[in-house]
């Protein structure tokens, strides 16, 4: 019997009946054995077939068999009810070998030409299975030339049998106080050949409770206890199970904080598995009773290990632990059934003693020393010398622990000095230079720093003076010795002030006339206002009406007197304002350069002379009484004049302050 080609030779070829294409002889038997490589099969088809037809092909036939299985017995030319001819059919081996047998009997009624067939090896697609057959692979099947391989979905691993997918279902640890776990793919059938381990691990003090829910279906056996697939539950105390079958197991109260669940499956079966809902319990803590003026959140029927509650106080109350204030309070239930922190108190908010008000005082309205929530206090400024700025002074203790004004401000009110107060009443007549009395010129400032000069207090920390008086100290403000509250130039009983900064008008040019002869000194501390130290007012817009020609102004200072010495006591003189053109004309003639008197100056004095300010008075204020407000304001600053003070036909020249209000206000607001 001729053998077909053997692998690894190319597996393809032609088979034909003996004598083909001529007729075949009687009593012939031919056998071909074709072998393909592993993973391949053989395909065979006929291009010519002409054999004697007989009942069940008993006489002449071609038989195709693969292993022990006969694939076909063929005869005739066309198929009948009981006989089969190949026609256009293609035949496939079941494995990698195909046997072809040709036989003719002892006679033929007429000549038959036999057959011609072609064969070839082709890849078997192992992944294609007939309906009703078990799939080649559990999950994914991949065909390739000469074979196939299986792979698994995420979460599975290929079993060593290379076909089954075992679940990667070990090492899951559940740490929440409750949860659910189930067999892989639940409620779909669980995977084969798998070993699953689940751990529930709660903090010490908790006890795990297991409830089987929904359905339970694990492969079982009528006689042997769970021989195929099983579920076991292990704690540090005992083991529960194995469980299998279709009945939901009862609740398991483990009395343990750690549980290990093991689920093992074999290679067969089609069951949906199981689902467990677990909860936990612990020793409850005492029910928290909220402190007065507080409430507990969240409200629960009971509180066990790890449960917590917070205390929130009503508006106007704050949390206190002992004497210490708390931003928040949360207590946690411990494993021994006690809370980790003692209950705090909700204590009424205490704003504490109110801050002292500089130049003012505070009065308790609600009650003496009462500083708790909703308590009211009233600030007021020291009468006569101070007034409260844009505030009614009423403050309430609010829930945030701050004293708060009716406008919602938490800062203190401001006591502003009252300006322009004087003990002096002005008369209509002009008197000669006179000694000032206490309280007459409480704004008067003595400036020592190389020379003797003067200034006027503005607010409680500024001094208005002449630029020429402090020009030398503009870069060394600390060199200025500033004294106030005294009438005597040489008295040790003065209030000392020190300069923080000197601001000279940018339009002033030293030794080139006296235009813009104005400067401000910022004091490094506020001075205390009293009857001897009071600021002068700045002129209102309407002030010009009190500074017309012949209106009386008052100049004061310790400058040179008629005797040619600096005055020991503060002196003052009442002098009328001089017509501007008249004054300009007075200083047009030599030795004065043209244009000495500018629009930024005003002049005052007597045509006959004798009443004037002099050297040492520089920077002092020429003041006027505002009859509407009954307050004194600064109209001029002692600036310059004739070489001989009080000379007839010459006048004292003063910086016109009203022209500089924006400059003054800008400096003070900026610094």
């Amino acid at each position: 019997t001729p053998l077909g080609p053997k692998w690894p030779e190319p597996v393809f070829g032609r088979l034909a009946s003996p004598g083909f294409p001529g007729e075949y002889a009687n009593d012939q038997e031919r056998r071909w054995t074709l072998t393909a490589p592993p993973g391949y099969r053989l395909r065979l088809y006929f291009t010519h077939f002409d054999l004697e037809l007989s009942h069940l092909c008993e006489y002449d036939f071609v038989k195709l068999s693969s292993g022990a299985k006969v694939l076909a017995t063929l005869c005739g030319q066309e198929s009948t009810d009981t006989e089969r001819a190949p026609g256009k059919d293609t035949f496939y081996s079941l494995g990698s070998s195909l046997d072809i047998t040709f036989r003719s009997d002892y006679s033929n009624e007429k000549p038959f030409t036999g057959f011609e067939a072609f064969y070839a090896a082709e890849d078997i697609d192992e992944c294609q299975v007939a309906p009703g057959e078990a799939p080649t692979c559990d999950h994914h099947c991949h065909n390739h030339l000469g074979g196939f391989y299986c792979s698994c979905r995420a979460g599975y691993v290929l079993h060593r049998n290379k076909r089954t997918c075992s679940a990667l279902c070990s090492g899951q640890v559940f740490t929440q106080r409750s949860g659910e776990l189930s067999s892989p793919e639940y409620p779909r059938p669980y995977p084969k050949l798998s070993s699953c381990t689940y751990s529930i691990s709660l903090e010490e003090g908790f006890s795990v409770i297991l409830d089987f829910v929904e359905s339970f279906d694990v492969e079982t056996h009528p006689e042997t206890l769970c021989p195929y697939d099983f579920l076991k539950i292990q704690t540090d105390r005992e083991e529960h199970g194995p469980f299998c079958g279709k009945t939901l197991p009862h609740r398991i109260e483990t009395k343990s904080n750690t549980v290990t669940i093991t689920f093992v499956t074999d290679e067969s079966g089609d069951h949906t598995g199981w689902k467990i809902h677990y909860t936990s319990t612990a020793q409850p803590c005492p029910y928290p009773m909220a402190p007065p003026n507080g409430h507990v959140s969240p409200v629960q029927a009971k509180y066990i290990l790890k449960d917590s509650f917070s205390i929130f106080c009503e508006t106007g109350y704050e949390l206190l632990q002992g004497h210490l204030p708390l931003k928040s309070f949360t207590a946690v239930c411990q494993k021994d059934g006690s809370w980790d922190r003692p209950m705090p108190a909700c204590s009424i908010v205490d704003c504490g003693p109110p801050d002292d008000l500089p130049s003012g005082r505070v009065e308790y309205i609600t009650g003496p020393g009462v500083t708790t929530y909703k308590a009211v206090i009233q600030y007021s400024c020291e009468e006569t010398f101070y007034t409260m700025k844009v505030n009614d002074g009423k403050y309430v203790c609010e829930a945030d622990g701050f004293w708060t004004s009716s406008k919602g401000e938490k800062s203190l009110p401001v006591c502003e000095p009252v300006c322009g107060l004087s003990a002096r009443t002005t008369g209509g007549r002009i008197y000669g230079g006179q000694k000032a009395k206490p309280g007459d010129f409480p704004w008067q400032v003595l400036i020592l720093g190389g020379t003797t000069a003067a200034g006027a207090l503005l607010y409680d920390n500024w001094v208005l003076t002449a630029a020429h008086a402090v020009y030398e100290q503009k870069h060394d403000a600390s060199a200025l010795d500033i004294r106030m509250g005294t009438l005597k130039r040489l008295s040790p009983h003065y209030t000392q002030a020190w300069s923080e900064a000197v601001f000279i008008h940018e339009g002033y040019t030293h030794d080139a006339g006296f235009d813009n002869d104005i400067a401000l000194i910022k004091l490094n501390n506020k001075v205390v206002i009293n009857s001897n130290i009071t600021p002068i007012c700045l002129p209102r817009k309407e002030a010009e009406s009190f500074m017309r020609t012949d209106d009386i102004g008052t100049a004061s200072g310790w400058g040179l007197t008629q005797r040619g010495f600096l005055a020991r006591n503060l002196m003052y003189v009442d002098i009328p304002i001089v017509d501007h053109q008249k004054c300009t004309a007075a200083y047009e003639k030599p030795p004065y350069p043209r244009g000495s008197v500018t629009a930024n100056m005003l002049c005052a004095g007597l045509e006959s002379g004798g009443k004037d300010s002099c050297r040492g008075d520089s920077g002092g204020a020429l003041v006027f009484l505002d009859s509407e407000t009954e307050r004194w304001f600064v109209g001029g600053i002692v600036s310059w004049g004739s070489m001989n003070c009080g000379e007839a036909g010459q006048y004292g020249v003063y910086t016109k302050v009203i022209n500089y209000i924006p400059w003054i206000e800008n400096i003070i607001s900026d610094f």
Partner: antibody, heavy 121, light 106 residues
């Protein structure tokens, strides 16, 4: 030269009073403030008060307000301090001192010789 | 009132040695003044306005400081410098003195 002359000692009975003098020479008396300072045995210096001789303007340390009275006699260029209701606590050396007028006016450039007051029965 | 605390209360120094006496004020002062007093004599002005030397005072004496901390320094101690030294202020009413530092010759 500038001098402030004081009597060396005064012995007085408890409850009585004493008037201490300080005679100035060598300068214009009315141009300088006159101060008085107490020094008790083994203790520091305490300022009592001062007076302007030109117009008798006076300032006292509150501690001595009811104890001391300051006056001047311009004609004799003498300053006085009257101490009343004396007790052993008032036993001390009492100095007059001239106030400086060149700078801050708040210190003493010339000191008197001091009078030792002993209050004893 | 402003309290002036002098330190040390008592000290001794050898001739030629540098000596420093400090005066601490309970609140800031503008100027400090220093006086020397020898037994049986009246006080004598040494330093005015913190650092200025009074007339007739040897240049080995100097003053320095500001605010609440001031000091008197003798650059080289001499036998005639053995005395009690007082600091004084009048930035705040009433005028006050320190309790004194007794300097002895070693």
């Amino acid at each position: 030269q500038v001098q402030l002359q004081q009597p060396g000692a005064e012995l007085v009975r408890p409850g009585s009073s004493v008037k201490l003098s300080c005679k100035a020479s060598g300068y214009t008396f009315t141009n300088y403030w006159m101060h008085w300072v107490r020094q008790r045995p083994i203790q520091g210096l305490e300022w009592i008060g001062d007076i302007d001789p030109s117009d008798s303007e006076i300032y006292y340390n509150q501690k001595f307000k009811d104890k001391a009275t300051l006056t001047v006699d311009k004609s004799s260029s003498t300053a006085y301090m009257h101490l009343s209701s004396l007790t052993s606590e008032d036993s001390a050396v009492y100095y007059c001192a001239r106030g400086d007028i060149t700078t801050t006016l708040r210190y003493f450039d010339v000191w008197g010789t001091g009078t030792t007051v002993t209050v004893s029965s | 009132q402003i309290v002036l605390t002098q330190s040390p209360v008592i000290m001794s120094a050898s001739p030629g040695e540098k000596v420093t006496i400090t005066c601490s004020a309970s609140s800031s002062v503008s100027y400090m003044y220093w006086y020397q007093q020898k037994p049986g004599s009246s006080p004598r002005l040494l330093i005015y306005d913190t650092s200025n030397l009074a007339s007739g005072v040897p240049v080995r004496f100097s003053g320095s400081g500001s605010g609440t901390s001031n000091s008197l320094t003798i650059s080289r101690m001499e036998a005639e410098d053995a005395a009690t030294y007082y600091c004084q202020q009048w930035s705040s009413y009433p005028l006050t003195f320190g309790a004194g530092t007794k300097l002895e010759l070693k």
